[in-house]
């Protein structure tokens, strides 16, 4: 409950906000959930707490885990959880689904792409912007404050946009990147019965006990902007929110991407610290639109290690 997913790349800055709302004057204590060990507030530490914010300067893969924040007002103590995952830098240009922020849609009249989470950081303009890993050049692209404006948007402008900026903390600079998909609204659209691209029905995924794993539910719904198109995960036929296991979280935003002109939506189920009991669960990827519902089931199995003699 009151758990928020946050993610970042190793050697970049990551700043996480406690998911409980309150005043800046409230005292906020941060802890490592597993050990209940208090997180220091001294800025000389690589990981330190600063009021409602938890700062990783820079982040390391080993920082992944659940962090507890307790917001202390004069009248109440409120508890929240930050579920942090730090990933290794990708060697190639491809940005995996689990690193994507929520999708934005644009049209000829409105083509703003906001840089996700930037308001948490101490940054100075200008931002650098990349599309599918290529630096954006040309007069059509204008980096304005915390967003990118594209003039005369065309369907070709759809794709993955990455913003890059520098966070400054006490004179030290740290790089931050964030990627989100941009879709272009197409007036001549249509919708189809959902087609689930992943997972395959009755698929089995091998996992390591104690490791983290991600399951992507991806479905296509037609062409152009869709009135209703949603994908979600269910555990043993129940909604994720009804399944009170903070290790298993569905990402908040649903990423919309266009594949061969089709409108496709993804959502990632993140399972931290895989346990034996997770192998007993049935994981259902559900895709729903006005035409109906389609369901694909995936199960987890323990990875078999082949011993060579």
């Amino acid at each position: 409950k009151f758990s928020k997913q946050s993610w970042g790349l190793e050697n970049e800055a990551l700043i996480v906000r406690c998911p409980r709302q309150g005043k800046s004057s409230y005292i906020v204590d941060w802890y490592y959930s597993q050990t209940n060990k208090s997180i220091p507030t001294q800025e000389r530490n690589r990981v330190f707490a600063s009021g409602q914010l938890l700062k990783f300067l820079p982040a390391e893969v080993a920082d992944s885990g659940i962090y507890t924040c307790i917001v202390r007002s004069p009248t109440f103590n409120r508890t929240g959880y930050a579920n942090v995952t730090i990933y290794k830098k990708q060697p190639d240009c491809n940005v995996p689904d689990y690193l994507m922020y929520s999708t934005v849609s644009g049209s000829e009249k409105n083509s703003k792409i906001y840089c996700p989470t930037i308001d948490l950081y101490n940054w100075t303009a200008p931002l650098e912007w990349f599309k599918n890993c290529q630096a954006l050049q040309g007069s059509r692209y204008k980096a304005h404050k915390s967003f990118l404006v594209i003039d005369n948007v065309m369907t070709d402008d759809a794709g993955d946009y990455t913003c890059k900026f520098i966070h400054n903390e006490n004179g030290a600079n740290y790089s931050v990147t964030a990627t989100r998909s941009f879709t272009v609204k197409d007036e001549q659209g249509f919708s189809l019965f959902p087609v689930i691209r992943a997972p395959a029905h009755n698929e089995t995924k091998e996992v390591e006990i104690g490791e983290n794993t991600n399951l992507t539910c991806s479905a296509c719904f037609g062409k152009g902007a869709q009135f209703l198109a949603t994908v979600q995960w269910q555990l043993n036929g129940n909604k994720i929110t009804d399944f009170s296991e903070p290790r298993i979280q569905q990402e908040e935003g649903q990423n919309q991407s266009f594949s061969n002109g089709l409108a496709c939506v993804n959502t990632v189920l993140r399972i931290a610290d895989v346990k034996e009991e997770d192998l007993l669960l049935r994981y259902d990827c559900l895709a729903l639109n006005l035409h109906g519902l389609r369901r694909h089931t995936i199960r987890l199995s323990r990875k078999h290690h082949h011993h060579h003699h």
Epitope: K1, F2, Q21, G22, K23, S25, Y26, V71, S73, P74, T75, F76, R78, T79, K239, T241, D242
Partner: antibody, heavy 117, light 106 residues
């Protein structure tokens, strides 16, 4: 102990405006949020809105949007709720209550506002 | 807007009885549900916050449970001084009170 003392009962004509005060003692009004709640005679509680007195940020329930204004004077630790364009159905007891963003912990004694022609 | 359905609207019970009041929301909320007691002519009093956290000084016969959309408030052994109207409050999105449950002694 935290105390919230509200201004006295009011009788108003339809179309008029009422302004109720709520003075906080043993507590710094800037340290938390101030909420206002309406309760019509024999009816349930209805949340009207809240203010963060330190910065003046307000949020109002849709039902009261446009007619209610919540303010706070941090120098006197007093919050105010003003309700305009009064109608007979606004006849109610109005409570101020301090708390955090999510709930109210300490309440005033209530102020009865009667709207009658 | 989040709607709250509180039931029953009134109930009559004997001293020593176990009393249960429920609140159902039309959308999944975190445990941002709180329970208030209001005695006639008095301001409401907070008993339980965040679903199940007892406010200091509140007797342990009062408890709260539930998550998602279904929440329950329980008085394990009704006392004469518990005669009041009880309200749930959600604060997941703005704040909304339930309709109230008037509790009387048989």
């Amino acid at each position: 102990e935290v105390q919230l003392v509200q201004s006295g009962a009011e009788v108003k004509k339809p179309g008029a405006t009422v302004k109720i005060s709520c003075k906080v003692s043993a507590f710094n009004i800037k340290d938390d949020y101030m909420h206002w709640v309406q309760q019509a005679p024999g009816k349930g509680l209805e949340w009207m809105g809240r203010i963060d007195p330190a910065i003046g940020n307000t949020e109002y329930a849709e039902k009261f949007q446009g007619r209610v204004t919540i303010t706070a004077d941090t120098s006197t630790d007093t919050a105010y709720m003003e309700l305009s364009s009064l109608r007979s159905e606004d006849t109610a007891v109005y409570y101020c209550a301090t708390g955090d963003f999510y709930a109210m912990a300490y309440w005033g004694q209530g102020t009865l506002v009667t709207v009658s022609s | 807007d989040i709607q709250m359905t509180q039931s029953p609207s009134s109930l009559s019970a004997s001293v020593g009885d176990r009393v249960t009041i429920t609140c159902i929301t039309n959308t999944d909320i975190d445990d941002v549900i709180h329970w208030y007691q209001q005695k006639p002519g008095k301001a409401p009093k907070l008993l339980i916050y965040e679903g199940n956290t007892l406010r200091p000084g509140v007797p342990s016969r009062f408890s709260g449970s539930g998550s998602g959309t279904d929440f329950t408030f329980t008085i394990s052994s009704l006392q004469p001084e518990d005669i009041a109207t009880y309200y749930c409050l959600q604060s997941d999105n703005m704040l909304t009170f339930g309709q109230g449950t008037k509790l009387e002694i048989k």
